[in-house]
Interface confidence: low
């Protein structure tokens, strides 16, 4: 049940009052306001929007709203020297050039400062050479190329289709394969849903549309020049050569019209199987190089982007808690966009704005939350989660002592089919209970709960009658809070039907066509899905900030720890002989999980029975719950990834967007059969089992009776 207990309030000021105050019409109005011009990080337009949000949050009634600025490394195209790709003949003449910009959408023809498509942080360069098609440029795609097909990408320019994994992983894989340039493109197989028209007549990607995005491999570092520390006025900055995560080869994105021109001439090897074929009318030959008459033609990249240290601005709003002001519940989402940000991020920012307005309304009527709520409008998320990470680095000591939870609020929608939630297991019960109280916005579920429609449309693969909740990965602003600091985190948005729509993300992601009209005409005309997401995000924040006992259930962590231990054990058991040879045992991990399960169960029993009127005991129990997520942090971090410190979850080493469980063990086991020194490799597996077992046991002990 929701708890109504907060201080200095009349009975009406409960969760229901907060939820009833949220209005779809307001979200629509805010979205329109936030999407009329581009708000690229580091630009004057985005600074002005920061000041507008600061002013409006103050009007809404927050106790304080401040701008927090940092000077970080950003990347922009050269305005007078555009980036493009050409096909050159044997004389070096350019016989085909890719587009320099996307055709602007109707009504936006006269908007200035639309940044042309580019891969942020690409180095400058003009490499030329033969093309190799590398499918999605995943780890397994390069295994297929190099090991099975014996294709050497060294000295080649590779062309990869967007989708499946974070683009930075694609570039890293290409670099490791020896490529000298990367072309990224959107294939209709991934970004054009069958039976839907392209924008402006539908929500599909037109042939001239291009996905922008950063191609860093930061592994949680934040600003590439100041890893671990805030990029403030007295920061000591690394040189570009020592910067974290920058790519070493030129990279550029294109649309499928331009990709067609490059791919139709490809020769060399046929695609290994149908999974390498997209939907263009080309053979999807792997190469290297062009076929037959075109074999003397080469591809040349012309990349002239520059990296610049630029000022960015976060907006931080505070609603002080009445009882525990030193306990922070944070709701944050980014403000910067690649162009108009119709979905990413402004569909999220508009929801945050309305949540702030609702909380402010309650506060003006005399209500305060039990705990402090912090609201954040992050800058430079698109350039590597920079705003959130720098702020968390600056405030890390406060956050690790006082941070209860972080709720992320980027795009509210990526479809309009059902809810999608990724969160710590501590929040499973909170999400279940909350969604049972909310009405479903879905057609055919009138009068039914959100929990019911969500469970029907997205069932849990493990537990019948429950909805799917996914692991947190990365690629968004919760990363520093969860993966580095160990603050319980969650995110929620409305999503597509993954079973029928196989395209990656949503088709117009990071393109100029991500406009207000895209949302208002095609995704959510009534803004009912936005409202539902506001209710979920806002409702979670309300409960986390207001319930007397924190709404965390440690027993759910016990369940997943067992599942993850079983999974990693089964991966290891694919090598039974080596496990025997090198005496690899998971007994310590399973024992720790068993102990955790028993201690969590006893803790939950005590949680039901203790005297909630005793503020000292209440605070003690709540602290045990708050610090449980923190207990999974290893101060030394994961191997070669010091800012990923959570032992149970980390972003996959092969796809930043995806979460991996027991990542230390997983990475130690990955491709272990190819390691040159098996004894050393299996030794590292044993070390990682030891670290995981110790961490689970140590976390369990934080839940034991204190004396």
């Amino acid at each position: 049940k929701s708890s109504n207990e907060a201080t200095n309030i009349t009975p009406k000021h409960n969760m229901k009052a907060f939820l009833d105050e949220l209005k779809a019409e307001n979200i629509k109005k805010f979205l329109y306001n936030f999407t009329q011009i581009p708000h690229l990080a580091g630009t004057e337009q985005n600074f002005q929007l920061a000041k507008q949000i600061q002013s409006q949050w103050k009007e809404f009634g927050l106790d304080s709203v401040e701008l927090a600025h940092y000077d970080v490394l950003l990347s922009y195209p050269n305005k007078t020297h555009p980036n493009y790709i050409s096909i050159i003949n044997e004389d070096g003449n350019e016989i085909f050039n890719t587009s320099l910009f996307e055709p602007p959408p109707p009504g936006y023809e006269n908007v200035s400062d639309i940044v042309p498509p580019f891969s942020a942080f690409s180095p400058q360069g003009m490499p030329e050479g033969d093309l190799v098609y590398v499918n999605y440029a995943r780890t397994e795609d390069f295994f297929k190329l190099e090991r099975d097909m014996k294709i050497n990408c060294s000295g080649k320019i590779v062309i990869a289709r967007y989708g499946k994994v974070f683009r930075g992983n694609k570039v890293k894989n290409a670099q490791l394969a020896g490529a000298k340039g990367v072309i990224l493109y959107s294939d209709p197989a991934d970004y054009f849903a069958p039976g839907v028209k392209s924008y402006p007549d539908g929500w599909n990607l037109p042939g001239g549309g291009v996905q922008r995005g950063n191609i860093l491999n930061l592994n949680g570092a934040g600003d590439p020049l100041t890893p671990g520390y805030p990029a403030n006025e007295y920061a000591y900055r690394r040189g570009i050569a020592e910067a974290v995560g920058l790519p070493s080869i030129p990279v550029h994105p294109i649309g499928y019209y331009d990709a067609q021109k490059l791919l139709e001439k490809m020769g060399g090897s046929a695609p290994p199987d149908s999974s390498w074929r997209g939907s263009l009318k080309v053979p999807y030959n792997v190469g290297p190089g062009f076929t037959g008459n075109f074999s003397t033609q080469k591809v040349k990249m012309h990349i002239h982007s520059t990296n610049e240290v630029t000022r960015i601005y976060n907006v931080i709003g505070t609603l002080r808690g009445a009882v525990e002001p030193d306990r922070y519940v944070i709701l944050g989402g980014h403000r910067d966009s690649w162009v108009f940000g119709g979905i990413d991020p402004q569909s999220g920012a508009a929801v945050v704005h309305e949540i702030v307005r609702s909380f402010g309304t309650l506060k003006k009527e005399g209500w305060r939350p039990r705990r402090t709520i912090l609201f954040a409008s992050w800058d430079a998320e698109e350039f590597g989660l920079l705003g959130s990470t720098e702020w968390a680095e600056e405030n890390s000591r406060l956050l690790q002592e006082r941070g209860v939870a972080y709720i992320n609020a980027d795009s509210s929608i990526e479809g309009n089919y059902t809810l999608r939630v990724d969160c710590t297991p501590l929040m499973y019960s909170l999400v279940h209970n909350l969604t049972k109280e909310l009405k479903s916005p879905d057609e055919g579920f009138e009068g039914k709960s959100l929990y019911e429609s969500w469970t029907k449309k997205s069932p849990s693969p493990e537990f019948s009658g429950m909805p799917r909740i996914s692991k947190l990965g990365s690629g968004n602003d919760f990363e520093v809070f969860f993966q580095r600091l160990g603050i319980a985190s969650g995110r929620a948005r409305y999503t597509k039907n993954w079973e029928t729509n196989k395209f990656s993300g949503y088709p117009l992601y990071h393109s100029v066509y991500e406009t207000y009209e895209l949302v208002e005409k095609f995704y959510d005309p009534m803004f009912k899905y936005h409202l539902t997401v506001a209710q979920v995000r806002g409702g979670m924040v309300f409960e986390l900030a207001n319930s007397i006992v924190l709404p965390f259930d440690c027993r759910d962590y016990a369940v997943v720890l067992r599942k993850y231990a079983d999974k990693i054990y089964s991966i290891s058991m694919k090598h039974p002989q080596e496990m025997k040879t090198y005496s690899v045992s998971f007994d310590s991990l399973f024992s720790a999980v068993k102990n955790f399960t028993e201690i969590a169960s006893k803790f939950s029993e005590r949680l039901q029975d203790f005297d909630k009127s005793n503020p000292i005991v209440l605070r003690m129990m709540n602290d045990q719950l708050m610090f449980l997520e923190r207990a999974f942090i290893d101060p030394l971090g994961l191997p070669d990834r010091p800012f990923y410190r959570h032992v149970i979850y980390a972003p996959s080493s092969h796809n930043k967007y995806a979460g991996e469980s027991f990542p230390g063990i997983y990475d130690a086991l990955f491709d272990i059969e190819s390691k040159v020194d098996p004894s050393k490799a299996w030794g590292e597996v044993k070390r990682q089992i030891y670290v995981a077992a110790f961490t689970v046991q140590a976390a369990a002990e934080t839940l034991s009776e204190v004396a």
Partner: antibody
Framework: EVQLVQSGAEVKKPGATVKISCKVS????????IHWVQQAPGKGLEWMGN????????TYAEKFQGRVTITADTSTDTAYMELSSLRSEDTAVYYC????????WGQGTLVTVSS | DIQMTQSPSSLSASVGDRVTITCRAS??????LNWYQQKPGKAPKLLIY???TRHSGVPSRFSGSGSGTDFTLTISSLQPEDFATYYC?????????FGQGTKLEIK
């Protein structure tokens, strides 16, 4: 050591269907495409199609399209080739092969189609 | 479909001879070409891939060359165990296609 072990010889009547298995060992099954190749008595090699066991993606030669179905069972590390509407000219040895360069081959399965 | 034509269809040679088999593609296949050896009652064995790269364990007397449409397999000094049928195969585009084979017999 990579091994591909195929099911035994079959005698079928015209119009019938044959299903041949190919059990692999010595590598992770989902890592390599599996191809099927036909060789009629005294004749050359003819590629029939392939499957990516990782996702079930298949590609078939036009000559066999509609009659051939290639499947893979990742739980048993086994690939299957089913050929329907058999005729006398389908009498042949059928091979499975794996690795993009057809590095490893099964021992072959003789299918005789006779009334 | 890409047609692969081998020549000769058969040839007789003696131990120690140098033998060359050619394979012609009906259209450009780059260097996406394999050579196989097959003995009676046995499965084919990969000899050469990417037109000129010897598969592991293949003796150095076997070599491949060519690109585009014309390819050759050369056996520098025939050994008794080399008498077999040899096939080329393109993997530039689907359907993957084989040559009709060259039968190498003892003179």
């Amino acid at each position: 050591e990579v091994q591909l072990v195929q099911s035994g010889a079959e005698v079928k009547k015209p119009g019938a269907t044959v299903k041949i298995s190919c059990k692999v060992s010595g590598y992770t099954f989902t890592e390599y495409t599996i191809h099927w190749v036909q060789q009629a008595p005294g004749k050359g090699l003819e590629w029939m199609g392939n499957i990516n066991p990782n996702n079930g993606g298949t590609t078939y030669a036009e000559k066999f399209q509609g009659r051939v179905t290639i499947t893979a069972d990742t739980s048993t590390d086994t690939a299957y080739m089913e050929l329907s509407s058999l005729r006398s000219e389908d009498t042949a040895v059928y091979y499975c092969a794996t690795g993009w360069n057809f590095d490893y081959w099964g021992q072959g399965t003789l299918v005789t189609v006779s009334s | 479909d890409i047609q692969m034509t081998q020549s000769p269809s058969s040839l007789s040679a003696s131990v120690g001879d140098r033998v060359t088999i050619t394979c012609r593609a009906s259209q450009d296949v780059g260097t996406a070409l394999n050579w196989y050896q097959q003995k009676p009652g046995k499965a084919p064995k990969l000899l050469i891939y990417w037109a000129s790269t010897r598969h592991s364990g293949v003796p150095s007397r076997f070599s491949g060359s060519g690109s585009g449409t014309d390819f050759t397999l050369t056996i520098s000094s025939l050994q008794p165990e080399d008498f077999a049928t040899y096939y080329c195969q393109q993997y530039n585009s689907y359907p993957l296609t084989f040559g009709q084979g060259t039968k190498l017999e003892i003179k």
